[in-house]
């Protein structure tokens, strides 16, 4: 799997999973975000050669093709595959509110 | 949506359904399929600006970031939604058989 | 363990191109980002630029114009390319990690290389 | 640029000392700041990051805080291999910027 484990520990110029922190006031401006301050959000990015990870046939095909006609730009694009969600700390007024934003982080990574 | 009714009648340079035909042979160098000669598979390219198209939170967050870095190269990727299969004819022998291959045809795309 | 380690001249002419290397272990180029910072004698430190794990650049706007930073990811080594060198470039310059890419603090330094620009 | 104002540029104390080190930022920098010791020859060690998160290994004696634009940096009892020039750092904005270092030294 394209995921922390493996490409945490590799160099790998291919779709991987690469960290990410990513602060919420400073680069995406949601000051209404108590907790936490930011998280490590991840990304997937790298080449998609042929069979790397392929996520369909299609993706399979595509790369094939790419590899053939290249110019086309036409190849699988590297894309995250497994998230899990991220609990956040807000205020409504005076209230607390804790809630679980699904799809937050980044878990592994696939060519689509 | 990002499909062929949308995307092949706009000139849009965000993600969007691009089509692509496939010849087996020549372009995949594929022998074995006898019918058909090649199909119509499509792909998904084009930018992914903040909110254009976004899968997840994840990619919703991603595209934000990317505006504000975008030498980071964490940009959401436009990649295949909906795909469809292939109905295809192939021979073991002389007995022909007709084969569904899934996911062989892009319907529409998304950022994610 | 993590180590950086620049090399490159110590002595520099004006007006010469320098050209300094960081050589990293126990971490891949393509998972964390390397930042060039230098401090010139007795004086603060100043961030020069960075290279992204994606391979992407980030300078400081007062060094734009003569700065490239470049990597070579299955040596694992950074290089910085500085033109146009003045006797005030007279520096220890430091490549530098940060703990999570965008976190943007530095968790792990070379030992540092004092460049002298001098005739 | 985020100009960062470091004081005082030098400070006189003994061991046993509380020290504090001040740093002013010239915006908000919503708690994006790190603090390093450096020692002569040797390149700068992180204390401090995210102004109050204690970097790993790094003595409990140290501790960060903020006030508004001004962030702190506390050593509550100087110990002798705390003798040492502190640098605070500004990690919110390109380019990330330094202040002119503080110089702890011997009473």
């Known amino acids: 799997a394209l995921d922390a484990a493996y490409c945490f520990r590799n160099v790998q110029d291919n779709c991987c999973l690469r960290p990410l922190y990513i602060d919420f006031k400073r680069d995406l401006g949601w000051k209404w975000i108590h907790e936490p301050k930011g998280y490590n959000a991840n990304f997937c990015a790298g080449a998609c050669p042929y069979l790397w990870s392929s996520d369909t046939q299609h993706s399979r095909v595509l790369s094939l093709y790419n590899t053939i006609n290249p110019e086309a730009s036409a190849s699988p694009c590297c894309v995250s595959q497994d998230l899990e969600p991220l609990t956040i700390l807000y205020y409504i007024g005076k209230t607390p509110k804790i809630e679980q934003l699904s799809n937050m982080i980044v878990k592994s990574c696939k060519c689509s | 949506a990002l499909d062929a009714a949308y995307c092949f009648r706009n000139v849009q340079d965000n993600c969007c359904l691009r089509p692509l035909y496939i010849d087996f042979k020549r372009d995949l160098g594929w022998k074995w399929i006898h019918e058909p000669k090649g199909y119509n598979a499509n792909f998904c390219a084009g930018a992914c600006p903040y909110l254009w198209s976004s899968d997840t939170q994840h990619s919703r967050v991603l595209s934000l970031y990317n505006t504000i870095n975008p030498e980071a190269s964490a940009s959401p990727c436009c990649v295949s939604q909906d795909l469809e299969p292939l109905t295809i004819l192939y021979y073991i022998g002389k007995t022909p058989k007709i084969e569904q291959l899934s996911n062989m045809i892009v319907k529409s795309c998304k950022c994610s | 363990e993590v180590t950086l380690k620049e090399s490159g001249p110590v002595l520099v002419k004006p007006t010469e191109t320098l050209t300094l290397t960081c050589t990293v272990s126990?971490?891949?180029?393509?998972?964390?980002?390397v930042h060039w910072v230098r401090q010139p004698p007795g004086k603060a430190l100043e961030w020069m630029g960075l290279?992204?794990?994606?391979?992407?650049?980030r300078y400081n706007s007062a060094l734009k114009s003569r700065l490239t930073i470049s990597k070579d990811t299955s040596k694992s080594q950074v290089v910085l390319t500085m033109t146009n060198m003045d006797p005030v470039d007279t520096a220890t310059y430091y490549c530098?990690?940060?703990?999570?890419?965008?976190?943007?603090?530095?968790?792990?330094w070379g030992p540092g290389t004092l460049v002298t620009v001098s005739s | 640029d985020i100009q960062m104002t470091q004081s005082p540029s030098t400070l006189s104390a003994s061991v046993g000392d509380r020290v504090t080190i001040t740093c002013l930022a010239s915006?908000?920098?919503?708690?994006?700041l790190a603090w390093y010791q450096q020692k002569p020859g040797k390149s700068p060690k992180l204390l401090i990051y995210?102004?109050?998160s204690l970097q790993d290994g790094v003595p409990s004696r140290f501790s960060g805080s903020e006030s508004g634009p001004e962030y702190t940096l506390t050593i509550s009892s100087l110990q002798p291999d705390d003798f040492a020039t502190y640098f605070c750092?500004?990690?919110?904005?390109?380019?990330?910027?330094f202040g002119q270092g503080t110089k702890v030294e011997i009473k």
């Open positions: 530098a990690r940060d703990p999570v890419p965008n976190k943007w603090h530095f968790d792990f």
């Open positions: 126990g971490f891949s180029l393509t998972t964390y980002n």
């Open positions: 290279i992204w794990n994606t391979g992407g650049t």
């Open positions: 915006e908000d920098i919503y708690s994006n």
């Open positions: 995210d102004a109050r």
């Open positions: 750092q500004q990690h919110h904005a390109y380019p990330f910027t």
